[in-house]
Interface confidence: low
């Protein structure tokens, strides 16, 4: 049967450690005698070494909790493929028994003394409770024992006296209306409330105590609306300086709602706290220059040579661009006005060509006319000569890339009767009408 195989056996605990895996036989697991195995159903961990006695287990708890008892411990024959000694098979337990004593003596019950006298009643009128006590000392308990039952008992008692009724205030009545209508006047508004000594009234016989404290209460009114103060504008402040150095700008004047400040819910100032004015510097703003698009590359030539077309001779060509639109001391364009590169001229060179794959379909033409069509092409593409892609410059300038320039004359085998371009056309389907989107909004 397959077992769990482990790489270690812990002698002190008898546990398997370092799981190797499951689903192997005992025989395979125990090819290494340092290993250990365990049945799948959570059985005993067995070491793969030859059988011998395990360490003794810890002593079991003492059989009694007080006075002399006894306790057991065991060890087990563990291992694989054999036995611990003659007639001692794997799994056999060996026991040891010894005397033990957790506590020298056992607890002994004590006995109660007689009940003491009843204490006075807990109240001086009507009904209450009284208590009496006894001691656990006839005899005293031994070895942590105790006496059975309670050390005190209580019973009801009646003083035969009627209790006086002391006066207590009823709830306060509602506050009277306020004596004024807003805060901050010459007389601070007040409100008043009263209460009666009737919850309950004090008894006559035996005489009860009257209610303590006043029957009336005064306080300043709260929650009254304060007398409102409307806000008023202060004067306009100075005009801010024009914030621009050229063209038109905007200056601001400000005023504050503080003469007076609105108070106690009074209305704020009506109107705007700021007003703006246009300011004119009468100075035109500078316009920075911007590079126009690069011009066409010049013909690819080499100094002192009439023509280098179709030759493996690198030449040079340049292109120019202009800085447009700079006015009123604006920034000049940054960067180079001229661009120079190295080139091979293949202008009008007969080159072997090959047909390209079909291009993607183009747009439908005409987009708004009758019967629009779309087209795709295959082109006779020239195969460029395998000239060196870079040239070495004078020392310190390193390698420079060389670009092919010019329009060659590619030669391809005829395709559908054509030598340079084969075109395929298709009508466009379900064509919508062209309408001005602004008209559609109306």
């Amino acid at each position: 049967d397959p077992v769990l195989c482990f790489t270690q056996y812990e002698e002190s605990s008898g546990k398997c450690k370092g799981l190797l895996g499951g689903g192997v036989s005992v025989k395979d697991c125990c090819l290494n005698t340092a290993y250990a195995y365990q049945e799948r159903n959570g059985g005993l961990c067995q070491p793969c070494r030859s059988p011998r006695w395990s360490l003794w287990s810890t002593w079991a708890p003492c059989s009694v909790t007080c006075s002399e008892g006894s306790q057991l411990r065991y060890r087990r024959c563990v291992g694989w493929n054999g036995q611990c000694s003659e007639r001692v098979a794997l799994g056999t337990l060996e026991w040891q028994l010894q005397a033990c004593e957790d506590k020298q003596c056992c607890p002994e019950m004590g006995g109660w003394s007689d009940w003491g006298p009843w204490e006075p009643c807990s109240v001086t009128c009507s009904k209450g409770m009284r208590t009496r006590r006894r001691a656990c000392d006839h005899p005293a308990p031994k070895c942590g024992g105790h006496c059975p039952g309670e050390a005190q008992e209580s019973e009801a008692c009646d003083t035969q006296q009627v209790c006086p009724t002391h006066g207590a205030w009823a709830a306060w009545g509602p506050w009277s209306p306020c004596s004024g209508s807003c805060h901050g006047g010459p007389h601070e508004p007040k409100e008043t409330r009263s209460r009666t000594c009737s919850a309950p009234e004090p008894s006559q016989k035996p005489p009860g105590k009257p209610c303590p404290g006043p029957a009336y209460e005064h306080r300043k009114c709260t929650g009254l609306p304060p007398c409102p103060v409307a806000g008023g504008w202060g004067p306009w402040g100075p005009v801010s300086p024009c914030p621009v150095t050229c063209g038109l700008g905007q200056t601001i004047e400000r005023r504050t709602c503080n003469r007076p400040v609105p108070q106690h819910g009074g209305p704020s100032c009506a109107g705007d706290a700021t007003r703006t004015h246009i300011c004119n510097t009468a100075v035109p703003c500078p316009v920075d220059g911007e590079w126009d698009l690069w011009g066409q590359w010049s013909t690819c030539v080499r100094r002192n040579m009439k023509s280098i077309s179709c030759e493996e001779i690198p030449g040079q060509q340049s292109r120019w661009r202009t800085c447009k639109g700079r006015k009123f001391d604006g920034h000049r364009c940054t960067g180079q006005q001229q661009d120079i590169r190295h080139c091979y001229s293949i202008q009008h060179c007969p080159l072997k060509g090959s047909w390209s794959e079909w291009s993607t379909w183009g747009l439908c033409m005409p987009p708004c006319g009758p019967n629009p069509t779309r087209a795709r092409q295959r082109l006779c593409t020239p195969l460029l000569p395998k000239y060196p892609p870079t040239v070495s410059m004078v020392e310190g300038q390193g390698e420079k890339n060389v670009t092919f320039w010019g329009r060659p004359l590619p030669r391809c085998e005829e395709l559908q009767g054509q030598k340079l371009v084969v075109e395929e056309k298709r009508p466009c389907l379900h064509v919508p009408a062209c309408k001005d989107p602004e008209e559609e909004k109306l």
């Epitope: 769990l4 546990k15 398997c16 799981l19």
Partner: nanobody
Framework: EVQLVESGGGLVQPGGSLRLSCAAS????????MAWVRQAPGKQRELVSE???????VYADSVKGRFTISRDNSKNTLYLQMNSLRAEDTAVYYC?????????????WGQGTLVTVSS
């Protein structure tokens, strides 16, 4: 801790099919083997099939060719497809997960699902 919950057991006629599922939750990243173990009334527990983390499978001779073990790691679920069921397949089927820890292995068990094959 790992929790295992089986489902899919029930009464089926001989020759019929059942599919058992075992949903695992908890510290499942350290599980290296999962297995189906069955216990027929009055008999010892018996390993039916097990599958390793990398998908290696083991079957008891009595179920080879009839039962298929599989696991869906995205759903943390173990399955046992049981075809051509026989009366002797009647048992409580337990899902078992074997977890690898640095200091030893731990076995986890589901509560079991009863499969009864009877006409």
């Amino acid at each position: 801790e790992v929790q295992l919950v089986e489902s899919g057991g029930g009464l089926v006629q001989p020759g019929g099919s059942l599919r058992l599922s075992c949903a695992a939750s908890g510290r499942i990243s350290s599980i290296i083997h999962m297995a189906w173990v069955r216990q027929a009334p009055g008999k010892q527990r018996e390993l039916v099939s097990e599958i390793s983390r990398v998908g290696t499978t083991v079957y008891a001779d009595s179920v080879k060719g009839r039962f298929t073990i599989s696991r869906d790691n995205s759903k943390n679920t173990l399955y046992l497809q049981m075809n051509s069921l026989r009366a002797e397949d009647t048992a409580v089927y337990y899902c078992n997960a074997l977890q690898y820890e640095k200091h030893g292995g731990a076995d986890y068990w589901g509560q079991g699902t009863l499969v009864t094959v009877s006409s």
